[in-house]
Every structure is written in structure tokens, then in C-alpha cells.
């Protein structure tokens, strides 16, 4: 790879925990998306909260390591948890510059693979997503 991985960086107000330390923020001015150059991986992530028909970005940034899913060229989110009734957290990992800016599509809530109502679930090594 010729360059260090660069991802979109965003943390919604009120989000607990920060991934800012996983990279170096680029000085991009105000009108551009904030960008972060990853320190420990070549992998970006994104987290969206889907409530009814509205998806709201919660976090975007660098992963702390290269893991399964990081080889994806695009952000294809999968459901990860139910932080509250009627809302679902979707996360993606991907391995190209700024690939976490947008998702390609969100599966409809309740589609196969969506965690049940027994509370938040995380795949092994994905506890970072639960720090919301």
C-alpha cells in the first residue's frame, strides 16, 4: 500500500468513548469531512443508528486492528445491537480510503441476521461498538 489508511472521522454528541486516539486527525478546515489517518490498522469503521426509517451516524473512524471485514472495499453495514426499543445499530468495516463515509445500503430492521430482542450483542472483538 502506498499510503497510510485515511478514514472519515465523526463522533456524535453524547457518544461515550472515543476512537480519536486510533489515528491522527488531518486539518481539513470546517466545510470538509473530518479525516483521520489510522495509526494501528488499515481499516475504517462506521456505526449508524437506524430508528424506523431514519439512519443517523453515530461514529466513524479507524479500527484498532485489521480484522475480518476490513478487506471489504465498501461499507456494507450489518446489524450489531439494539440500544433501545425500535432502534438498531449497524456497523461496517472496510479497507479503502474514506470508505466509511457512506454505507452502500442498510438491511431493513428485522431482516434475517438482525439480533433478537434479548439485548445488545457483539461479535467477538467488537466490544468497541458497545461503548456508545
Amino acid at each position: 500500500p502506498p499510503n497510510r489508511r485515511t478514514c472519515v472521522f465523526f463522533e456524535a454528541p453524547g457518544v461515550r468513548g472515543s476512537t480519536k486516539t486510533l489515528g491522527e486527525l488531518l486539518d481539513t478546515g470546517t466545510e470538509l469531512p473530518r479525516a483521520i489517518r489510522c495509526l494501528y490498522s488499515r481499516c475504517c469503521f462506521g456505526i449508524w443508528n437506524l430508528t424506523q426509517d431514519r439512519a443517523q451516524v453515530e461514529m466513524q473512524g479507524c479500527r484498532d486492528s485489521d480484522e475480518p471485514g476490513c478487506e471489504s472495499l465498501h461499507c456494507d453495514p450489518s446489524p450489531r445491537a439494539h440500544p433501545s426499543p425500535g432502534s438498531t445499530l449497524f456497523t461496517c468495516s472496510c479497507g479503502t480510503d474514506f470508505c466509511n463515509a457512506n454505507y452502500s445500503h442498510l438491511p431493513p430492521p428485522g431482516s434475517p441476521g438482525t439480533p433478537g430482542s434479548q439485548g445488545p450483542q457483539a461479535a467477538p472483538g467488537e466490544s468497541i461498538w458497545m461503548a456508545l
Epitope: 500500500p1 497510510r4 489508511r5 485515511t6 470538509l32
Partner: antibody, heavy 113, light 112 residues
Framework: QVQLVQSGAEVKKPGASVKVSCKAS????????VSWVRQAPGQGLEWMGE????????NFNEKFKGRVTMTTDTSTSTAYMELRSLRSDDTAVYYC??????WGQGTLVTVSS | DVVMTQSPLSLPVTLGQPASISCRSS???????????LEWFQQRPGQSPRRLIY???NRFSGVPDRFSGSGSGTDFTLKISRVEAEDVGVYYC?????????FGQGTKLEIK
Amino acid sequence: QVQLVQSGAEVKKPGASVKVSCKASGYTFTDYWVSWVRQAPGQGLEWMGEIYPKNGVSNFNEKFKGRVTMTTDTSTSTAYMELRSLRSDDTAVYYCARQRDYWGQGTLVTVSS
Amino acid sequence: DVVMTQSPLSLPVTLGQPASISCRSSQSLEYGDGYTYLEWFQQRPGQSPRRLIYGVSNRFSGVPDRFSGSGSGTDFTLKISRVEAEDVGVYYCFQATHDPNTFGQGTKLEIK
């Protein structure tokens, strides 16, 4: 095939500005960083910075901060590098490159009173 | 800034003989993601630079296999197994691990 074609030579007076263009073809312009590198006469190469055309995010050499602006026009697959407050030691060949793998032919900028 | 120091600065070589260029960085070029962002460029007289090697040892497409790169940390080497006439020019190492990215001062390869 990948090609980067730069604008022609420029002669500028000290204090003026210059804007060099770099038209890309043969690849998806928005998928690669465009780097800018300069080379003073008989000297080595100096990295100036880079820009990601898809969103305009750029990363500069601090040495040029405040004097350089890098922009892109995705509709024409063209990158631009503007250098302001020119001095005689800005006389150099300015190169654009696609993430440093394919390079333009260079643009000679001469700063002279 | 990270200083890239090349040696020798001038390299006279006989055609068909091997050549070796050293590049030392003032800081380690191994990044936190495990990669080392070290590249080598060739600049023939009157031409634009051309990438030969990226990631220390990966040959760029179209580069003859007589060119090879090696090294780690702060010490890197570009080797040409058998020098040909078309190899004449200046060779630069380059690091993209630290900002600002920096080039070595160049090594001029000429035929004896």
C-alpha cells in the same frame, strides 16, 4: 492507460501567484490521492502535499501551509495546485502524480523580477 | 522532519555489474499498522520520476526484476543485479510514514 497532463510553463514575478493544472485520464479520478512534488533546478525532489478528489481532503507539507491551495474538479478530472506569494526560490518544476505511481510531465515555474 | 540520507551520492558502475544504493532514515519507518511506507524512484535525465519500489520490496508494475528493494526500520537498500544503459539517472528513496513525507537527496548512477 493512466495519463496525467500538466499545464504549460509559467514565468511569474515575486509576490505573484501561479496555478498549475493536472488533467487525469485512464482511471477513476476520485479513487486516488493526487500528490504534488516539486524539483528546483539541479536539485532533488520535495513533497508538497496531496489531495483526495472525492471529498477535497488534503494533507500539506507544513512548509507550504498558508501559501498553497490544492483543489480538484471532478467533472473534468483535473487537479490544481496554486502557490501564492512566490519567491525566487520557488523556481522549480512542479509535478503532479497519482499517489506517486504515475506522474505528469512537470510544469516549469520560473519566478523572476 | 524525517531526514532520508542516501549513499553514495554518485555511483559509477560498469555495464552488466551490480549496483547498490543505501538509504537511512532518521526515525523508524515502520508504522503502527505494521507497514513500512518506503519507496524508491528513478529519474532518468530530462524525465519525470518513475516509481520502482513501494513498501520496501514490492516492485511496481513494469519494473524489471533486476531491481530489488530490502531493509527494515531505518536501513534500506535498492539493488540492481546487472546495470543496463537505460538505468542511468538519479535514484531517490522516499518515506510516507511520517508527515511531511520526505525524499532522500538522490544518488546519481552513471556508466563507467
